[in-house]
């Protein structure tokens, strides 16, 4: 997942963005300014942390919006948040733009934020426990010289009368088959719904699609179905976002 991304602001507009805890949001206040704007001030809600970055120098912004900064092409904002939102778009950063006279905002740009916590976790050391947000995840690399979570190749046949090994089909016929796979949990925490246009997507690259298969258990309590969601021709899967604190269990085979 990207550790930082850029959001485009526009004066006279409110922009909605999802913020993932542990990342940075960057936004350019200069290109979003109206004609005639000379300075700007900032306000933000209490769970939002904003820094004005000019020529590589960062300055933290107080919540009260009293300070003014000169607009220049090198001025950007770096935004982080400290906790998941309870409501969609409930946190905000407001940029007030002032003209030469500088007495009253001539315009405003609004960044309305929804913070969510996302963690994709696996039983990296195969001790039977899916750990939570392993700090070394960012350095994991795929391949023979790689490091990270161990993934077993599921090359036996739980159903002997089938011609293919388990890793060569997209079906799960028994719970025994799941025991050969690694567990993976997608943990999310956030408001009841995401802002319009946002969804959570699991994806794999084309080059990895023939090396891994991911399954999801539907109806875990009755009439279980094991659905193949990633691998082979399936490069992405849209996850149903349920809101609050949620854990979705997946099974991964090599």
């Amino acid at each position: 997942m990207l550790r930082e991304r850029t959001v485009r602001l526009q004066y006279g507009s409110r922009v909605e963005a999802v913020y993932v805890l542990g990342t940075y949001l960057w936004t350019d206040v200069y290109s979003a300014a109206p004609a005639g704007a000379q300075t700007f001030s900032l306000k933000h809600s209490e769970h939002v942390w904003v820094e004005v970055v000019r020529d590589g120098e960062a300055e933290e912004v107080a919540t009260n919006g009293k300070q003014r900064w000169l607009l220049s092409p090198s001025t950007t904002l770096r935004v982080t948040m400290s906790q998941a939102s309870t409501e969609a778009s409930s946190d905000k950063v407001t940029v007030n733009y002032y003209d030469e006279e500088g007495s009253i905002p001539i315009d405003q740009a609004g960044l309305f934020l929804t913070a969510i916590e996302i963690s994709l976790d696996v039983d990296a050391d195969r001790d039977g426990v899916v750990e939570k947000n392993n700090p070394k995840k960012a350095s994991w690399t795929w391949g023979p010289e790689g490091q990270g979570a161990i993934l077993l190749v599921n090359c036996d046949r739980e159903t002997p009368w089938l011609p293919k090994e388990d890793c060569r089909d997209e079906k799960v016929y028994s719970k025994e088959d799941l025991k050969d796979m690694s567990q993976m949990i997608l943990r999310t925490k956030g408001p009841d719904r995401l802002p319009a246009g946002y969804e959570i997507v699991l994806y794999i690259s084309m080059s990895d699609s023939d090396k891994v298969g991911v399954f999801y258990v539907e109806n875990p309590f009755f009439g279980q179905r094991y659905i193949h969601i990633l691998g082979r021709r399936k490069l992405y899967h849209v996850v149903k976002y349920t809101g609050g604190s949620a854990e979705l269990l997946f099974f991964v085979e090599g």
């Epitope: 006279g12 005639g36 306000k43 009253i104 001539i106 609004g110």
Partner: antibody
Framework: QVQLQQPGAELVRPGASVKLSCKAS????????MNWVKQRPGQGLEWIGM????????YYNQMFKDKATLTVDKSSSTAYMQLSRLTSEDSAVYYC??????????????WGQGTSVTVSS | QIVLTQSPAILSASLGEEITLTCSAN?????MHWYQQKSGTSPKLLIY???NLASGVPSRFSGSGSGTFYSLTLSSVEAEDAADYYC????????FGGGTKLEIK
């Protein structure tokens, strides 16, 4: 629907103060600036000031800096304007008006019915 | 602060006539808003950002202009259009024009 409710009239003595109210409904009170505008009988409109109900940040027309004080009560979604040391020059209709920087180009899209203030002994 | 001057102060028009109200600024304004105020009522947003019609406003109203000169045009005056019309800008300090009173003959 959006409504800004203001009392119809206030009669006050010269030198006294008056606190005008503007009760908002039909929208999220803290998401829009509230403006106050003065209109003397048979005259045009004069901008007094505005307040951001989310944090009470306010701006004033210099001419009203010592005359008007803007406040809000978020719990009741009500904006207030206190006018002090009243003279006959302050006899006018006072409107509250909502301003949205993110729509209508920042124009005032909804107005209250206005409160008529008469300063008389 | 920007001073807005509206002309004419009073305009008498016949039903169906096309009329233009003007608003000039003593220095450049980013854009202009227009309000209509009928007798005994509060102002109502008519046109915002120079040329955009507010919701529910009939299409016979239109606005144009830039810099220091702006105008409001009614393509065909109707009886219900009798009102005061104010231009309003928001650069530096917000200011209003003195108004134009539209009377129907």
């Amino acid at each position: 629907q959006v409504q800004l409710q203001q009392p119809g009239a206030e009669l006050v003595r010269p030198g006294a103060s008056v606190k005008l109210s503007c009760k908002a409904s039909g929208y999220t009170f803290t998401s829009y600036w509230m403006n106050w505008v003065k209109q003397r009988p048979g005259q045009g409109l004069e901008w007094i000031g505005m307040i951001d109900p989310s944090d009470s940040e306010s701006y004033y027309n210099q001419m009203f800096k010592d005359k008007a004080t803007l406040t809000v009560d978020k719990s009741s979604s009500t904006a207030y304007m206190q006018l002090s040391r009243l003279t006959s020059e302050d006899s006018a209709v006072y409107y509250c008006a909502r301003k949205d920087y993110y729509a209508y180009g920042g124009a005032m899209d909804y107005w209250g019915q206005g409160t008529s203030v008469t300063v008389s002994s | 602060q920007i001073v807005l001057t509206q002309s004419p102060a009073i305009l008498s028009a016949s039903l169906g006539e096309e009329i233009t109200l003007t608003c000039s600024a003593n220095s450049s304004a980013r854009y202009m808003h227009w309000y209509q105020q009928k007798s005994g009522t509060s102002p109502k947003l008519l046109i915002y950002s120079t040329s955009n019609l507010a919701s529910g406003v009939p299409s016979r109203f239109s606005g144009s202009g830039s810099g220091t000169f702006y105008s409001l045009t009614l393509s065909s005056v109707e009886a219900e259009d009798a009102a005061d019309y104010y231009c309003h800008q928001w650069s530096g300090y917000p200011t209003f024009g003195g108004g134009t009173k539209l009377e129907i003959k």
